[in-house]
């Protein structure tokens, strides 16, 4: 990895061992200076593998609300608007980091947690399982 | 929102104002107890809107490595394996939280940051703009 010289103005840290506890400023900085401002807002409906978004809420997590995609069909929508079962709709998943209150119900103490979320769906050619 | 009683065993916190600084344990807990264990590993190639994954590395960010999807084509792959430009490949984007070292180069002090990443691509019917 790349070694970066430590800034002498860093806050003091007692324990250098893992599991390490760090200070995090929750005042979120939004870096979404996206060159393509159009977001995936209507793709869920226009996709050949359409999906619905479900709200997943957990007050012990930060962010407390996460939207989960569920593919509408096992097949994909063809040019006629019908479901074509020769193709498969599959979820596109991503591991994301969230903060989990630890100990529970604590407003200022968290643990980093990795969760798998489904962001949308895509249409794929099926895997053909050949029987010997 | 849901109000949860504060746990009396919480670490003490000086400043209750935003921007609030919290303690975060970086020993990641992995909650991926997924009922559908098959992950999106080969979907990027099998999709009718295939994509390539590009490594985005930033040592001032946690996680330092993020993979970004870029759609291979403007159109979608049809049943013959050719690109059909009557359909559009579009990126599915998601806002995720990362930790940004602040002040820079500090190992134990971060600020929460929201970034937009492309996770994969999906094939959509184009929006037809009618000229008046």
């Amino acid at each position: 990895g790349i070694t970066i010289p430590r800034n002498p103005g860093c806050p003091n840290s007692e324990d250098k061992n893992f599991p390490r506890t760090v200070m995090v400023n929750l005042n979120i900085h939004n870096r979404n200076t996206n060159t393509n401002p159009k977001r995936s807002s209507d793709y869920y409906n226009r996709s050949t593998s359409p999906w619905n978004l479900h709200r997943n809420e957990d007050p012990e997590r930060y962010p407390s609300v996460i939207w989960e995609a569920k593919c509408r069909h096992l097949g994909c929508i063809n040019a006629d608007g019908n479901v074509d079962y020769h193709m498969n709709s599959v979820p596109i998943q991503q591991e994301i980091l969230v903060l989990r209150r630890e100990p529970p119900h604590c407003p200022n103490s968290f643990r980093l947690e990795k969760i798998l979320v489904s962001v949308g769906c895509t249409c794929v050619t099926p895997i053909v399982h050949h029987v010997a | 929102g849901i109000t949860i009683p504060r746990n009396p065993g919480c670490p003490n916190s000086e400043d209750k104002n935003f921007p609030r600084t919290v303690m975060v344990n970086l020993n990641i807990h992995n909650r991926n107890t997924n009922t559908n264990p098959k992950r999106s590993s080969d979907y990027y190639n099998r999709s009718t809107s295939p994509w390539n994954l590009h490594r985005n590395e930033d040592p001032e960010r946690y996680p330092s490595v993020i993979w970004e999807a870029k759609c291979r084509h403007l159109g979608c792959i049809n049943a013959d394996g050719n690109v059909d430009y009557h359909m559009n490949s579009v990126p599915i984007q998601q806002e995720i939280l990362v930790l940004r070292r602040e002040p820079p180069h500090c190992p134990n002090s971060f600020r929460l940051e929201k970034i937009l990443v492309s996770v994969g691509c999906t094939c959509v019917t184009p929006i037809v703009h009618h000229v008046a």
Epitope: N52, L74, N88, P126 | K38
Partner: antibody, heavy 124, light 113 residues
Framework: QVQLQESGPGLVKPSETLSLTCTVS????????VSWIRQPPGKGLEWIGI???????DYNSAFKSRVTISVDTSKNQFSLKLSSVTAADTAVYYC??????????????????WGQGTLVTVSS | DIVMTQSPLSLPVTPGEPASISCKSS????????????LAWYLQKPGQSPQLLIY???TRQSGVPDRFSGSGSGTDFTLKISRVEAEDVGVYYC?????????FGQGTKVEIK
């Protein structure tokens, strides 16, 4: 607990529109999808269509041209409208909640809670 | 549309004895991406609405007694009751949730001998 209750006129004249309401309680509308199913007297079950949590719909193509399913979230109510009815539409009509499974990334089309059903007779 | 064919259509049973119902689909219900079979079983007791017993061929819905079990793959499926009880009488339906429209079998009436 989860409850679904169908209501509407028990008698509809041929060529008219059958209108039913399904009032639900005990679960969150934004999470769950609801299907309508019917059962002609002495016969089996027939899926009519579904309304997803976002208000989108999918219908059995056998009914597509004459069916509409909608939701009024403020009243916790779903509705079914079936136009141009004939005697063949005489049936017990059920609304049912589609099973929601966390950490499973497809909509489900099996139903884990059903209303008690309402009999609709089409006759002049 | 996918045709679901159940047999037998009528099944007289003796309490304490096993019972078995067959369901055949006109197309495979196995989804290659997750190896799940999209078949569910319901029981409609006399005068009641259907209740979900089993989904994904063999997963019992919560609260369903373990005397009920499901098996099969592709196009051939079976519901077994290891020891029939009086409360198990009614009409059993299989349903495929793979292809739209989502279709049911014609039902198997289970009654006490």
């Amino acid at each position: 607990q989860v409850q679904l209750q169908e209501s509407g006129p028990g008698l509809v004249k041929p060529s008219e529109t059958l209108s039913l309401t399904c009032t639900v309680s005990g679960f969150s509308l934004p999470s769950h999808s609801v299907s309508w199913i019917r059962q002609p007297p002495g016969k089996g079950l027939e899926w009519i269509g579904i309304i997803w949590n976002n208000g989108g719909t999918d219908y059995n193509s056998a009914f597509k041209s004459r069916v509409t399913i909608s939701v009024d979230t403020s009243k916790n109510q779903f509705s079914l409208k079936l136009s141009s009815v004939t005697a063949a539409d005489t049936a017990v009509y059920y609304c049912a909640r589609n099973f929601y499974i966390t950490d499973y990334y497809y909509e489900n089309y099996f139903m884990d809670a059903w209303g008690q059903g309402t009999l609709v007779t089409v006759s002049s | 549309d996918i045709v679901m064919t159940q047999s037998p259509l009528s099944l007289p049973v003796t309490p304490g004895e096993p019972a078995s119902i067959s369901c055949k689909s006109s197309q495979s219900l196995l989804f290659s991406e997750n190896q799940k079979n999209y078949l569910a079983w319901y029981l409609q007791k006399p005068g009641q609405s259907p209740q979900l017993l089993i989904y994904w061929t063999s997963t019992r819905q919560s609260g369903v007694p373990d005397r009920f079990s499901g098996s099969g793959s592709g196009t051939d499926f079976t519901l077994k009751i290891s020891r029939v009880e009086a409360e198990d009488v009614g009409v059993y339906y299989c349903q495929q949730s793979y292809y739209t429209p989502y279709t049911f079998g014609q039902g198997t009436k289970v009654e006490i001998k």
